[in-house]
């Protein structure tokens, strides 16, 4: 079921602030039909952010991801882009999608499908409010706002489009970077039923350096926030599951965020992942100026995780 590439599936109203390329695993350009050109960045936690293609850091990040993808390919990596419908991974999200919401955009275009491979944690992380704020505490202050769980790789607060939870079905994207080990949303599409991202050994929570996937770009994890906060252990648990705008700038200096505005269908969650609140800080996820994303339900179900209250989120304690 290929749809034409004419329709705009993601519209960015706001652009994210800088995100370390180490935290990014893929990027894609939105369609020309969207009018405002933007680069959609996916973090290792599978959070999506809109970025301005004219900014130098975005250009550098894309270049870096392109190099990584090329290196992966040279090394016999398995990064492939897949077009078409991708079945959801069989691996259930470890923690349930909790707050995730299923997004059903109208897929347009030939994006390659992404498969989120989330681990529940990932999902949780993703759930974390925008990336945790900087948990930069050097341990000195015994409290660290838990940066958003790793799942929330940092991202500027308020700019996140939406998180693609690991457990959702694939989304259609074209990725230009290698798939990063661990929960990943982009499909490593090799088969319609993509294997879980982790290698069996990894699943056991152990990984050995030689694996090729290790080369995937890594993404930083803390919230890019400026304040530090404790990392709460079970910090936040959200109950509501409605269509919630995805995070907004979770990263530290991220500018107003871009969120995905979509009609969402709550997904029943197995449990609410305990999330680490976002770090302290003055930022609060903004729910305004959502991004419009439309996707074809048939093509994919993207899980979106709502962004918790900035205050609700507090770091690890």
């Amino acid at each position: 079921q290929h749809h034409g590439v004419t329709k705009c599936n993601i519209t960015c109203s706001k652009m994210t602030s800088k995100i370390p390329v180490a935290l990014l695993i893929h990027y894609q350009q939105n369609q020309a039909s969207c009018g405002k050109r933007a680069i959609i960045l996916e973090t290792r936690q599978h959070r999506l952010f809109c970025a301005d293609p004219k900014e130098q850091w975005v250009k550098d990040a894309m270049q870096h991801l392109d190099r990584q993808a090329a290196a992966l390919t040279r090394n016999g990596g398995t990064f492939e882009k897949q077009i078409g419908e991708v079945k959801p991974r069989t691996t259930p999200a470890a923690g349930g999608m909790d707050e995730s919401v299923v997004l059903e955009p109208e897929a347009t275009g030939e994006s390659s499908s992404l498969e989120p491979t989330p681990s529940s944690q990932e999902a949780q992380r993703a759930l974390g409010t925008s990336p945790e704020l900087p948990t930069g505490v050097t341990g000195s202050s015994g409290t660290r706002l838990p940066p958003t769980p790793k799942a929330q790789d940092g991202g500027p607060v308020g700019t996140e489009l939406f998180r693609v939870p690991p457990v959702s079905t694939a989304a259609t994207w074209q990725s230009s970077a290698p798939h990063q080990p661990g929960p990943s949303l982009w499909a490593e599409a090799k088969t319609s039923e993509a294997p879980s991202t982790q290698d069996p050994s990894t699943q056991a929570s152990t990984a050995s350096s030689p694996a090729p996937e290790e080369n995937a770009p890594s993404e930083g994890q803390r919230v890019w926030g400026q304040g530090q906060s404790p990392r709460p252990e079970n910090s936040l648990e959200r109950e509501e599951m409605g269509p919630v705008p995805a995070h907004t700038d979770a990263f530290q200096d991220w500018g107003p965020g871009s969120m995905a505005h979509v009609s969402v269908v709550p997904v029943s969650s197995e449990g609410t992942p305990s999330r680490e609140p976002v770090a302290s800080g003055s930022w609060t996820p903004k729910a305004e100026e959502p991004i419009h994303a439309t996707m074809d339900p048939q093509r994919l179900g993207v899980l979106i995780t709502p962004v918790p209250d900035a205050q609700a989120a507090t770091r690890r304690q």
Partner: antibody, heavy 119, light 107 residues
Framework: QVQLVQSGAEVKKPGASVKVSCKAS????????IHWVKQAPGQGLEWIGW????????KFNERFKGRTTLTADKSTNTAYMLLSSLRSDDTAVYFC????????????WGQGTTVTVSS | DIQMTQSPSSLSASVGDRVTITCRAS??????LAWYQQKPGKAPKLLIY???TLADGVPSRFSGSGSGTDYTLTISSLQPEDFATYFC?????????FGGGTKVEIK
């Protein structure tokens, strides 16, 4: 309060292996990456790699690939670094550290584990 | 890989002095720079991240600045407890790399 407590000093012979542990407490272990950093005697700091305890996925500095294995045990909130085929230049203090999700800078560190490789 | 070059490698100063340490990256690290302080036999302690954001509990006499490839750590008025070794670290891209360190000694 966040704490990373590492295992004690080790003395090994060349060719042997050593497994250093890092027990985390005070936060949700599976939500934050654990990084490993090497500091040879009188030298600077060198990033070895990270592991995400949530799913066990690792990432390595190419310089340390091949002889280094990073694992995590969610049941005990402990991360491990296994160094195999030890050489004299592996003699160093190894630190585990963790940071926020917005970037991989390290706000909490273990106390360090000294590994001495000597015949 | 991005190389981080720190200078000076050591310096002698007195209490009350203003001290400046620089770190130069081999490529643009977009302000994703952290500074650490390490004392003998101890683990490093985070002072600053994102080029200028002070970590929790760090005295305001420490400040960071810079952009692109050049960054600076400044201690406005050196205190007795500041005599230590300082390292910069870039976290823009992996592998994360550290500067060689600057040892601040008592004059």
């Amino acid at each position: 309060q966040v704490q990373l407590v590492q295992s004690g000093a080790e003395v090994k012979k060349p060719g042997a292996s050593v497994k250093v542990s890092c027990k985390a407490s005070g936060y949700t272990f599976t939500n934050y990456y654990i990084h490993w950093v090497k500091q040879a005697p009188g030298q600077g700091l060198e990033w070895i790699g990270w592991i995400y305890p949530g799913d066990g996925s690792p990432k390595f500095n190419e310089r340390f690939k091949g002889r280094t294995t990073l694992t995590a045990d969610k049941s005990t909130n402990t991360a491990y670094m296994l160094l195999s085929s030890l050489r004299s230049d592996d003699t160093a203090v190894y630190f585990c550290a963790t940071g926020p999700t917005d970037g991989d800078y390290f706000d909490y560190w273990g106390q360090g584990t000294t590994v001495t490789v000597s015949s | 890989d991005i190389q981080m070059t720190q200078s000076p490698s050591s310096l002698s100063a007195s209490v009350g002095d203003r001290v400046t340490i620089t770190c130069r990256a081999s490529g643009n690290i977009h302000n994703f720079l952290a500074w650490y302080q390490q004392k003998p036999g101890k683990a490093p302690k985070l002072l600053i991240y994102n080029e200028k954001t002070l970590a929790d509990g760090v005295p305001s006499r420490f400040s960071g600045s810079g952009s692109g490839t050049d960054y600076t750590l400044t201690i406005s008025s050196l205190q007795p407890e500041d005599f230590a070794t300082y390292f910069c670290q870039q976290f823009w891209s992996t592998p994360y790399t550290f500067g060689g360190g600057t040892k601040v000694e008592i004059k």
